[in-house]
Interface confidence: low
């Protein structure tokens, strides 16, 4: 049968097995979770994208699967990222009351995952899938991350990190969904700081990345919000992440592994 | 605290089937899954799969799929294994065994385990 | 399926001394900084016992003489000092994926 073809690459094989024993999974070691039933999960995860045109995906059509997700995270617990997911989920697993989006349950559903349906029929297209630049943006993946993340971003409280990767040539970047979704979806009502980790990638990088243009604009946009931004360098992401795991080590300095703070009003 | 308590042994003929029950106490049972494992004479130990009590989801081992079906009971508390079609290799003893972790789950309550001997 | 190689198949050792057994996958078992590794002991006609979690993290009521380390796709398990009652089986156990998979087991035995 004739499908459309797109540029990007087809739902992720197994993706209805997958999304099952992975809800299975969490529920199942989640003890707040465990009134989820996850066919009910999968059924609106489905619904949300099985025989829809998947260039024409609504942040609606996900509405009933957060509504079954509904998740909240304690003050001062939230870790955002951008473009360093690997370093923060490293992060999260060894300070465990900390959560980024992948460790709530509809982001560790979909994590790494592609997904996309057709126009009237009820297949799941594993062929191919609507590329955010050359096919469209509404498509079924971008939309889901766009509406979880705003969630997120929404009922998040107290002290806000952000987890930034310095080596990259924009720290900040406004096109990120961190600074078009997440940045824009802070509640100044409820958060009282973002403070931003800026992650440096060489060794003997001794640079404050803190005083980057990017990171300024950052701090511009949040102190428009009405949001204080306070940033910090993490010039050695491994000694950190040991420092976390063991905060007692003697080389462990006082602080987040000999970072320097910058306070912003 | 949590308990697993497993059916008494089996000796079963060669082509029938058996099932074994594991019956759970001192948690909700429909909050977590519970896995079988296998243990041949000899031969160390096999992941054969779990079930999902709160909605019966399964995932099995492909090994073992087609031949074991793992079912529950919720209000009973009991899980259940059956293994169809037995040969002489299926002569093992049969534990269940829940999770407990963190994110990712290991092996923290066991059944006694059930011995089946599958007759000629 | 990821295959687990423990050594040696047997240890024959005296109280009082150290057993360090050895576990390596076929592939790397890490994921976002954990090994997905775990160690079980048993002893005939019982369940196995967790030991150790996520490679090196020691089970409630485990003692101290019991230690796990490793990364990627090589694990161990040190026992030291021996006591009498630590003469058993010892699993390895990997659940990064599906199916998860147990070692052939090392047999650790009073000489």
């Known amino acids: 049968r004739w499908r459309q073809q797109w540029s990007g690459s087809g739902t992720t094989s197994r993706f209805p097995e997958t999304v099952l024993a992975r809800c299975v999974k969490y529920t199942e070691v989640h003890p707040e979770m465990r009134h989820v039933d996850c066919q009910s999960v999968w059924d609106a995860f489905k619904g949300a994208f099985i025989s829809k045109y998947p260039c024409n995906i609504t942040e609606e059509d996900y509405q009933p699967l957060v509504k079954l997700g509904t998740q909240t995270v304690p003050c001062n617990k939230t870790l955002l990222w951008s473009r360093i997911k690997d370093l923060a989920h490293q992060f999260t697993q060894v300070q465990r009351d900390m959560f980024t989006l992948e460790d709530m349950l509809l982001g560790y559903l979909a994590d790494d995952l592609t997904w996309c349906g057709e126009f009237n029929t009820f297949e799941i297209n594993y062929q191919s899938c609507p590329d955010w630049r050359k096919d469209c943006s509404n498509n079924p993946v971008s939309v889901f991350w766009k509406t979880v993340s705003r969630r997120f971003a929404e009922t998040a409280c107290g002290v806000v990190h952000v987890m930034l990767n310095g080596s990259r040539s924009k720290i900040f970047d406004k096109n990120s969904t961190f600074g078009s979704v997440e940045v824009h979806n802070l509640q100044p009502e409820k958060v009282q700081a973002l403070e931003a980790w800026v992650i440096h990638g060489g060794r003997e990088d001794s640079r404050d990345l803190c005083q980057d243009p990017t990171i300024k604009e950052l701090e511009s946009i949040i102190s428009k919000r009405n949001i204080r931004f306070f940033c910090k360098n993490i010039y050695r992401p491994d000694k950190f992440l040991q420092c976390v795991k063991n905060p007692e080590d003697s080389s462990c300095l006082s602080g987040i592994s000999a970072s320097h703070h910058h306070h912003h009003h | 605290q949590v308990q697993l308590v497993q059916s008494g042994a089996e000796v079963v003929k060669s082509g029938a089937s058996v099932k074994v029950s594991c019956k759970a106490s001192?948690?909700?049972?429909?909050?977590?899954?519970m896995h079988w494992v296998k243990e041949a004479p000899g031969q160390g130990l096999e992941w054969i799969g779990y079930?999902?009590?709160?909605?019966?989801?399964?995932n099995y081992n492909q090994k073992f799929q087609g031949r074991a079906t793992l079912t529950a009971d919720t209000s009973a508390s009991t899980a259940y294994m059956e293994i169809s079609s037995l040969r002489s290799e299926d002569t093992a003893v049969y534990f269940c065994?829940?999770?407990?972790?963190?994110?990712?789950?290991?092996?923290?309550?066991w059944g006694q385990g059930t011995l089946v001997t599958v007759s000629s | 399926d990821i295959v687990l190689t423990q050594s040696p198949a047997t240890l024959s050792l005296s109280p009082g001394e150290r057993a360090t057994i050895s576990c390596r996958a076929s592939?790397?078992?890490?994921?976002?900084?954990?090994?997905?590794m775990h160690w079980y002991q048993q002893k005939p006609g019982q369940p196995p016992r967790l030991l150790i979690y996520?490679?090196?993290s020691r089970a409630t009521g485990i003692p101290a003489r019991f230690s796990g380390s490793g990364s990627g796709t090589d694990f161990t398990l040190t026992i030291s000092p021996l006591e009498p009652e630590d003469f058993a089986v010892y699993y390895c156990?990997?659940?990064?994926?599906?199916?998860?998979?147990f070692g052939g087991g090392t047999k650790l035995e009073i000489k």
């Open positions: 996520l490679a090196s």
């Open positions: 079930i999902y009590p709160g909605n019966g989801g399964t």
């Open positions: 065994a829940r999770t407990g972790g963190l994110r990712r789950a290991y092996f923290t309550y």
């Open positions: 156990q990997q659940n990064k994926e599906d199916p998860w998979t």
């Open positions: 001192g948690y909700t049972f429909t909050s977590f899954n």
């Open positions: 592939e790397s078992v890490d994921s976002y900084g954990n090994g997905f």
